[in-house]
Interface confidence: low
């Protein structure tokens, strides 16, 4: 038992050192774009980076290179900085990330923010087959057409649970939705993409109406849709909300994991120390009993 103790102590110390080594980088900051990650050409956008109070420096990186630096004053009162882009263009579109520093300690880099410039060049045409009003269970396909040179198309549905679907084709891409349910109801638009971060003007919206029986409707409520002028806002809440929640979960999960591991190591060490102490105590007691018994035996022998 006593020989295993140093080994366990070593394991414990190594683990705790590993845990403290993991703390040598600060948690990653949140990054998001306001009002939206999809920015019309020549419009303004603000990239926000939220780290920790006390951060003395924030760095915004674009496509892997340092893009801008901000040093908040006073750092202990500020946990978020904003990088303003007054005039969006294709050169500013791409992947952004940010990091921050507290003292000499740097954070992990944030998640990547894909900043997209829209309203480039042309406007695609969005059509739906067999038509905008269908019965639940019917197969529906969207067609996005753009005659200028592009091979990638994007279909977006307005609403909280919006997803960007990619399609490919020389001048037209098709987006088969398969047999639709009332959950597919909503307003759709498409874009032509000249590269991952430069998109065309949005198409005119197409509103898909799916009629079904009452049970279906109650089981699959329609996504909240927004008028055309808030096209830009609906995704903002989804994107940034999800991103923040995800990053927050990352922090919490990591910290819980680290704390849990440290606690387990501590419990194990205490248990083994107690076990070792009890073991030694038992050995001493046995030795004591043995010596007492030996003394009595000798005494008896002498008496005899």
């Amino acid at each position: 038992m006593s020989s295993t103790l140093p080994a366990l102590l070593c394991v414990g110390l190594c683990l705790s050192q590993r845990i403290s080594a993991q703390q040598q980088t600060l948690p990653k900051p949140f990054i998001w774009a306001e009002p939206h990650f999809m920015v019309p050409k020549e419009k303004q956008v603000t990239i926000c980076c939220q780290g920790n109070y006390g951060a003395v420096e924030y760095q915004l990186h674009f496509e892997g290179s340092l893009f801008a630096v901000d040093r908040p004053k006073p750092p202990e009162r500020i946990n978020k900085v904003q990088f303003y882009i007054p005039d969006m263009n294709s050169r500013m579109a791409g992947q952004y990330s940010c990091i921050y520093r507290v003292g000499e300690l740097w954070s992990e880099p944030s998640n990547l923010l894909d900043l997209v410039v829209t309203e480039m060049y042309d406007t695609p045409t969005l059509s739906v087959h067999p038509g905008p009003e269908v019965i639940s269970g019917e197969k529906v396909t969207f067609y996005c057409r753009l005659d200028t040179a592009t091979s990638m198309f994007l279909l977006l549905k307005e609403g909280r649970s919006s997803h960007v679907q990619r399609g490919y084709g020389k001048v037209q891409a098709e987006f088969p939705l398969g047999p639709v349910t009332t959950a597919h109801r909503g307003t759709y638009r498409c874009f032509g993409s000249y590269n991952n971060h430069a998109w065309s003007f949005p198409s005119e919206p197409v509103k898909l109406l799916v009629t079904g029986d009452i049970e279906n409707t109650s089981l699959a409520p329609e996504d909240p849709t927004f008028p055309a002028d808030t096209w830009g806002t609906y995704l903002l809440t989804t994107e940034t909300g999800l991103q923040k929640d995800h990053a927050l979960w990352d922090h919490t999960a990591q910290n819980l994991l680290r704390m849990g591991l440290a606690f387990l190591v501590l419990v194990a060490l205490v248990w083994f120390l107690v076990e070792d102490w009890l073991s030694r105590k038992r050995t001493r007691e046995r030795a004591s009993r043995a010596s007492t018994w030996e003394g009595r035996r000798r005494l008896n022998t002498q008496t005899l």
Epitope: G64, V69, R91
Partner: nanobody, 124 residues
Framework: EVQLVESGGGSVQAGGSLRLSCAAS????????MGWFRQAPGKEREGLAT????????AYADSVKGRFTISQDNAKNTLYLDMNTLKPEDTAMYYC?????????????????WGQGTLVTVSS
């Protein structure tokens, strides 16, 4: 991406002069810092001169101070290195590099964009 293409290298007698050019194309708005470097055979790459493209501030290595001049032509997106009083030890492959400034100063190493280089040979 930023593309950099050097030109103007060649052979010259000691004491002579050369002008190197570096044509930048692509997303040059991302190149706050531009610089000239050289690498002689069997030696490490050496920084010679840098320029802050936004305001024209320059900095030189001691080995070339007073002999080499870095300049830029923003209209042509071109960087220059005027080399005077050349010595045989200036023989090397000369590279143009570009990057963003880091916290107000050009990076000391690890620049992002590099040209292919142009060879300068100085004979005695």
């Amino acid at each position: 991406e930023v593309q950099l293409v050097e030109s103007g290298g060649g052979s010259v007698q000691a004491g002579g002069s050369l002008r190197l050019s570096c044509a930048a194309s692509g997303y040059t708005y991302r190149t706050d810092c531009m610089g000239w470097f050289r690498q002689a055979p069997g030696k490490e790459r050496e920084g010679l001169a840098t320029i802050y493209t936004s305001d024209g501030r320059t900095a030189y290595a001691d080995s070339v101070k007073g002999r080499f001049t870095i300049s830029q032509d923003n209209a042509k997106n071109t960087l220059y290195l005027d080399m005077n009083t050349l010595k045989p030890e200036d023989t090397a492959m000369y590279y143009c590099a570009a990057d963003l400034q880091y916290g107000g100063s050009c990076p000391s190493g690890g620049w992002k964009y590099w040209g292919q280089g142009t060879l300068v040979t100085v004979s005695s």
